[in-house]
Interface confidence: low
């Protein structure tokens, strides 16, 4: 297995609508035609898969229809957006990149992006 460097921002603050975006960049050592990107969430020493997408170089990422993630790719950069986040989803989001084809297979795991999510204050009731 060959290691590959993956870079991602250290900290991102989600918007008031629960949307967080960050760039995952990988230093491709080979000429991959198929890439798989997986977002993992680490919280309290538990690691869970948030979403994953496979794409052909030059094409768009394809996440499952019910995924909370969307993304676009440009060269060796993947722009990831995670939606529907709430305060309880605050945690370290790790970008994992795999060069699936052609071989040899490469695996790269970023150090993670700490995403902070703050639930918006509820609007006070108005009497009109």
């Amino acid at each position: 297995c060959k290691a590959m460097h993956v870079a991602q921002p250290a900290v991102v603050l989600a918007s008031s609508r629960g949307i967080a975006s960050f760039v995952c960049e990988y230093a491709s050592p080979g000429k991959a035609t198929e890439v798989r990107v997986t977002v993992l969430r680490q919280a309290d020493s538990q690691v869970t898969e948030v979403c994953a997408a496979t794409y052909m170089m030059g094409n768009e990422l394809t996440f499952l229809d019910d995924s909370i993630c969307t993304g676009t790719s440009s060269g060796n950069q993947v722009n990831l957006t995670i939606q529907g986040l709430r305060a309880m989803d605050t945690g370290l989001y790790i970008c994992k990149v795999e060069l699936m084809y052609p071989p040899p297979y490469y695996l790269g795991i970023g150090n993670g992006t700490q995403i902070y999510v703050i639930d918006p204050e509820p609007c006070p009731d108005s009497d009109f």
Partner: nanobody, 126 residues
């Protein structure tokens, strides 16, 4: 500890068929991208085929395309290689492998590094 045990090899005549099996243990098999690689006598390691963790995508070396089929059964922690229309040049030691292993022997050759088992010998001869 991660373990991969291959079986199903043997002596077969040209044009014949074999089905290799690889039983995995010691790791979450269903999360792993699996491959078959082979090493012919006196030659380096050659990648043969790979399959996604969920079995949704498969890949083959040009030399085996249309003759070999890789598959997996995650419930049984097993990956298979169905080999049809075998040729003498398919004679080799076949290894089931995952590139993500943290334990076990490592096979490296020509830019490929895989973690795998002890292999199963396939000999194609008349």
């Amino acid at each position: 500890q991660m373990q991969l045990v291959e079986s199903g090899g043997g002596l077969v005549q040209p044009g014949g068929s074999l089905r290799l099996s690889c039983a995995a243990s010691g790791f979450t098999f269903s999360s792993y991208y699996m491959s078959w690689v082979r090493q012919a006598p006196g030659k380096g390691l050659e990648w043969v085929s790979s399959i996604y963790s969920d079995g949704s995508n498969t890949y083959y070396a040009d030399s085996v395309k249309g003759r070999f089929t890789i598959s997996r059964d995650n419930a049984k922690n097993t990956v298979y290689l169905q080999m049809n229309s075998l040729k003498s040049e398919d004679t080799a030691l076949y290894y089931c492998a995952t590139p993500r292993g943290a334990h076990g022997p490592t096979y490296c050759s020509g830019g490929y590094c895989y973690y795998g088992g002890q292999g199963t010998q396939v000999t194609v001869s008349s």
